[in-house]
């Protein structure tokens, strides 16, 4: 089963000159020599207005969806990775119940 997450759309204030993009981002491995990056003036919203959006996780901008989402650290979940899983408290709970 797959948990489909919320995505948040950054505000639309792009200019016409910023309207094309040839290389989205995912892999940082070799082979990317900067070719086709002449139109890469657009700012990644994760580095701007969404810089502190993910509380316990990494902000990711998904170009296809024009939206940001959060890759949560272990134990955290929710739209902004702000909620902690209760699973980690099971040992404490069991000791309190004695």
């Amino acid at each position: 089963s797959v948990r489909v997450e919320q995505v948040v759309k950054p505000p639309q204030n792009k200019t016409e000159s910023e309207n094309t993009s040839d290389k989205p981002k995912r892999k940082k491995k070799g082979g990317k020599n900067g070719k086709n990056r002449r139109n890469r003036k657009k700012k990644n919203p994760c580095n701007a207005e969404f810089q502190n959006f993910c509380i316990h996780g990494e902000c990711k901008y998904i170009e296809h969806l024009e939206a940001v989402t959060c890759k949560c650290q272990q134990e955290y979940f929710g739209e902004r990775c702000g909620e902690k899983s209760m699973k980690t408290h099971s040992m404490i709970d069991s000791s309190l119940s004695k």
Epitope: K9, K23, P24, L65, E66, K71, C72
Partner: antibody, heavy 125, light 112 residues
Framework: EVQLVESGGGLVKPGGSLRLSCAAS????????MSWVRQAPGKGLEWVST????????YYPDSVKGRFTISRDNAKNSLYLQMNSLRAEDTAVYYC??????????????????WGQGTLVTVSS | DIQMTQSPSSLSASVGDRVTITCRAS??????????LNWYQQKPGKAPKLLIY???NLQSGVPSRFSGSGSGTDFTLTISSLQPEDFATYYC??????????FGQGTKLEIK
Amino acid sequence: EVQLVESGGGLVKPGGSLRLSCAASGFTFNSYAMSWVRQAPGKGLEWVSTISTGGSHTYYPDSVKGRFTISRDNAKNSLYLQMNSLRAEDTAVYYCARHGYLLYDGYYEWYFDYWGQGTLVTVSS
Amino acid sequence: DIQMTQSPSSLSASVGDRVTITCRASQSVDYDGHSFLNWYQQKPGKAPKLLIYAASNLQSGVPSRFSGSGSGTDFTLTISSLQPEDFATYYCQQSTEDPPYTFGQGTKLEIK
């Protein structure tokens, strides 16, 4: 029911132009990236262009870059492909396709989940 | 650019046979343990149809005799027991966020 219907294909001379349209229905159009994929007669599938949900990001292979322009009108649930400086090798059936996707754990998995029936573009003198 | 190579280019099989088609990418299409590879079926004169996404997930409505596996650069599409309607051409496609979004050259599955 998801439906994608292409139109605008036809016979055009080398160097000419053509504009393809794709009318979408049965889903929230502005929530999906869209693409054009073509298939030359008797050949395999070739990706032609992709546009993001709001049109801010467009992508092309080198074979069509500078000649083809993808666009969308979310108010009209329509996708377009403007093809200029057409060549004989652009002869193909052109399909519009929706990018289905899963988003989980910060990962974005996408695939072409719905396709139109295709429209034939023939470039010949 | 990532090149996708399918093998075989064509094969003949009989109804009831188990069939395997392979797809090899010129570089990994994995990212943090996720495989960005899809499989499509196309019949003559028809649009392609999605069978498998993310290497191993069966698309809704696709019969369970179809399955996908693999990771990194090597992937397989398996049809466990071939049915008459399965004779078609099959394509793999990489769906990383790095264009071009390339397809394999196709594998034509014919009746023996």
